[in-house]
Amino acid sequence: ITQQDLAPQQRAAPQQKRSSPSEGLCPPGHHISEDGRDCISCKYGQDYSTHWNDLLFCLRCTRCDSGEVELSPCTTTRNTVCQCEEGTFREEDSPEMCRKCRTGCPRGMVKVGDCTPWSDIECVHKESGTKHSGEVPAVEETVTSSPGTPAS
C-alpha cells in the first residue's frame, strides 16, 4: 500500500457541503476550514477522514499497488481497503509490500496453516509441534505439498 499522504484543500469547491463544527470538531467525512468556522466535506474517491477532527485537510485515499486487489473503495469516511493477491501475503513488520508465500515446508516439518493475504504458510516440527521461525529454506530442503495435504 502506498503511504497515505494528505490532501490540502485551500478552498472548498462549490459542490462541497459545509456545516458548522461541533465542539470545535468536524464529523467524519469532513475537515475544518482555515478560519475554523466551517466543516468542509472530503471529496469522494479522493480523500477521507474517519473520525471527528479539526484537521485542515482530509487524508488522501490510498491507491492499491500492483499485486494487490481492492476489497472496498475509498469513501469520504473510510480509506481504500487493499489486500494481497492470492499466493502472496503482507507481513506485520514489512507492510509496504506483498511477499510470495512459501510453496512448502522444510524437511521434518509439516504444514498446519495455509497461505492467506496476511500470513505465510505455517510450518511446525513433526515431533515437537513447535513453529518454524519463518526463514525461507534452501530449495533442496523444501518439501512441497498440494494445498491441504500435509508434507510427509
Epitope: L6, P21, D35, H51, D54
Partner: antibody
Amino acid sequence: EVQLVETGGGLIQPGGSLRLSCAASGFTVSRYAMIWVRQAPGKGLEYIGFITSDGSTYYADSAKGRFTISRDNSKNTLYLQMNSLRAEDTAVYYCARYTYSDGTDLWGRGTLVTVSS
Amino acid sequence: DIQMTQSPSTLSASVGDRVTITCRASQSISTYLSWYQQKPGKAPKRLIYKASSLASGVPSRFSGSGSGTEFTLTISSLQPDDAATYYCQPNSGIATYGAAFGGGTKVEIK
C-alpha cells in the same frame, strides 16, 4: 493596540492551586481559539491546551486532569486554572491567539509561576 | 499525537552565513507549519506560517519551505539580531493531535 497580558503568576507551594488570567485588548477572545503554552527555565516551549471559539477545550496529556482553561467573554479574558501544582510546573506561562491555518499569531509576555516549598 | 523533531539543536554561524534549520513531523501535516523566534526573556514571535508565508514585519532574509513531513527554515544572510532560539509547530489538528512544538534550535553568532 492588539495585545495579551498574563497575570496571576508567583510563588506557590507544591500541592497548591493558582489561576492565571490573560486579558485581551484590541480583539474579541470569543471569536478566536486561544492557546496556553509554558516554558520551564532553560527548556523549550510546551503546549498545554486550547479553547475554541465555541468554548470547547482540549489539553495536552500532561495537562489533563489538573489544568482547566476557561474564558469570561464579558471581561474579554482567558483563564488557566492549575491544581495540585508540582515543582516541575515551574515555568513561564504564555497565553496566545491561535488561528487554525496561520498558527499562533499573537503572544502575551508571559507570567512566571514558581512551585517551591 | 504528532511529534516534531528539530535539527540541529544548536548551531553557531558567522554574520552573513546562510543558515538552515530542519523540522520533521511524525505524520504529514501538508503545509500547515509555523516557525517562531524567541529571544531570552521574551515571548516567541511568529516568523513563518503555512510553511512558507512570511509573517508581517519579518525581514525577507527569513524563508520557509517544505510540505508533508519535512520542513526547512532558512536565514539567507545571518545578522547579529538573529541570535535566538527557533521553534516549529504544526497548525492542523490541534484538538485531534495536539500542538507539540519542536525541541528548538539555538542559533549563536560566532
